[in-house]
Interface confidence: medium
């Protein structure tokens, strides 16, 4: 009796399953009871000797490439051996590497978690993923794993993490880079500082008073609101960050508390109040303001 080993598929791709079948075409199955065993190179596979003429291999990898055969024996210990069959496992090169972010869009709040997810549309076997910061490419981390995606995590994002990032994937056919992804770190506004600027030390009625409000930290654009005794005077924007000013032509009614508020969509902050009082210097003919 002759024995044949059949592999299906005969040219598997990495990661795909293969079924090995040990066939005896010239022997009726009722003639004798057989035990089967499958081998690669010099090693027995799976459960060793078994009553099943089939062996299912869930996933084949590049290192599973080799010479396979099977053996069959009757209960009387007669052993039949198949010829060797070469099974070559085909590796798919990595292709279409992409870098995505969590949160999506690459905008992240300072202090929040940022995950850079490197993915390949195709590619099999052990894939080495590498993450780089900046267009010139400061290597941040590398991971080798048998999956189409890998993650690099920045647990608490800082302002200095605002940069372009890219990743590279490689599985033996040369490195394949992703496109650049820009990370924007959004910073809530700090408590603004309100400064009152007058054309002279003792500001007088009809002078123009400049209210300058500035949050020293915060992602632009920043919207500033100006208040006198909790009444809205108006708003000004700082499209590129920094401060903003509001001008006021002084009258006697402008004595009192002034404050300002900054908001960039990540939360509002109110300044401390600044008090402006009228004083009448001795011998003076007109009212003056002091803060």
């Amino acid at each position: 009796a002759e024995l044949f080993l059949i592999a299906s598929p005969s040219h598997p791709t990495e990661g795909s399953p293969v079924t090995l079948t040990c066939k005896m075409p010239f022997l009726q199955s009722s003639d004798a009871q057989f035990q089967f065993c499958f081998f690669r190179d010099t090693r027995a596979l799976g459960p060793g000797w078994s009553s099943s003429p089939k062996l299912q291999i869930a996933a084949m990898w590049k290192e599973d490439t080799g010479s396979y055969w099977c053996e069959a024996q009757t209960m009387a210990s007669k052993v039949l051996r198949s010829r060797r069959s070469q099974i070559n496992v085909h590796r798919v090169p990595v292709a279409d590497v992409s870098l995505e972010t969590q949160p999506p869009g690459g905008q992240v709040m300072e202090g929040d978690r940022l995950v850079l997810i490197c993915s390949v549309a195709m590619g099999t076997g052990d894939i080495t993923f590498l993450w780089y910061k900046g267009a010139v490419g400061l290597n941040l981390q590398s991971k080798t794993q048998r999956s189409l995606t890998a993650e690099y995590e920045i647990p608490s994002v800082r302002e200095s993490d605002a940069e372009q990032y890219y990743c590279v994937a490689e599985n033996g056919y040369g490195p394949s880079p992703s496109g650049l992804v820009s990370i924007t770190v959004r910073i809530p506004v700090s408590r603004p500082i309100l400064m009152l600027r007058a054309p002279r030390a003792q500001a007088a009625v009809e002078d123009v008073l400049e209210l300058h409000c500035e949050a020293l930290r915060g992602s632009p654009p920043i919207l500033y609101w100006f208040y006198h005794e909790d009444i809205t005077l108006g708003s000004r924007s700082a499209p590129s960050g920094g401060g903003a000013s509001f001008n006021l032509s002084l009258t006697e009614e402008h004595s009192g508390n002034y404050s300002c508020e900054a908001n960039n969509g990540l939360g509002a902050q109110r300044s401390e109040a600044v008090t402006l009082n009228f004083t009448v210097p001795t011998g003076a003919r007109s009212n003056h303001l002091t803060s």
Epitope: L223, T232, S235, S237, P239, N263, L266, G267, A268
Partner: antibody
Framework: QVQLVESGGGVVQPGRSLRLSCAAS????????MHWVRQAPGKGLEWVAV????????YYADSVKGRFTISRDNSKNTLYLQMNSLRAEDTAVYYC??????????WGQGTMVTVSS | EIVLTQSPATLSLSPGERATLSCRAS??????LAWYQQKPGQAPRLLIY???NRATGIPARFSGSGSGTDFTLTISSLEPEDFALYYC??????????FGQGTKLEIK
């Protein structure tokens, strides 16, 4: 008298466009941010878009991003909402509202937009 | 996105009674919360800003309280004209400027 008056609503087929206007009077229009807010029949209020007082910054709700454009003409004291690729779910009363920094203090009477084939 | 949840959805009371409406935020909005009243066929009307400040011309029977995530609108003694829809809105984090789903105050 501080007032906002919307116009431009009507019945339009899905996929078509419409432009809403909001005429402001009684206050210095160029000092205030302006919003569009909508209310579908029998539903709650949904913020749509904002434009800052100087027109330099615009933000949109995710549901309209890429389809709607907010703009303003400070010389004409008018706010606009250009609505493209309209869908049935855009059917609503559209209000313009003034941003007072701490609330929307002045609202228009609203204009009805019906998207139907 | 900050989610505002109003409760109850409907409140049935009689004129003269006290009404308490609640608004809860999914994360802190500091005191940047406004309340609006809306009557059928009309635009919303600002009642309260900064969680507790009455807008110009709003009667003293309307009051707001709370900060952070929990806010309350109280109408001390209901007048017939107070039966309407009430919405809360946060202005701390944007976009979007989110509204609650509304509370309907109806006559019992």
């Amino acid at each position: 008298q501080v007032q906002l008056v919307e116009s431009g609503g009507g019945v339009v087929q899905p996929g078509r466009s419409l432009r809403l206007s909001c005429a402001a009077s009684g206050f210095t229009f160029s000092d205030y941010g302006m919003h569009w807010v909508r209310q579908a029949p029998g539903k709650g209020l949904e913020w749509v878009a904002v434009i800052w007082y100087d027109g330099n910054n615009k933000y949109y709700a995710d549901s309209v991003k890429g389809r709607f454009t907010i703009s303003r003409d400070n010389s004409k004291n008018t706010l606009y909402l250009q609505m493209n690729s309209l869908r049935a779910e855009d059917t609503a009363v559209y209000y313009c509202a003034r941003d007072w920094g701490r609330a929307f203090d002045i609202w228009g009477q609203g204009t009805m937009v019906t998207v139907s084939s | 996105e900050i989610v505002l949840t109003q409760s109850p959805a409907t409140l049935s009371l009689s004129p003269g009674e006290r009404a308490t409406l609640s608004c809860r935020a999914s994360q802190s909005v500091s005191s940047y919360l406004a309340w609006y009243q809306q009557k059928p066929g009309q635009a919303p009307r600002l009642l309260i800003y900064d969680a507790s400040n009455r807008a110009t011309g709003i009667p003293a029977r309307f009051s707001g309280s709370g900060s952070g995530t929990d806010f309350t609108l109280t109408i001390s003694s209901l007048e017939p004209e107070d039966f309407a829809l009430y919405y809360c809105q946060q202005l701390n984090n944007w976009p979007p400027y989110t509204f609650g789903q509304g509370t309907k105050l109806e006559i019992k």
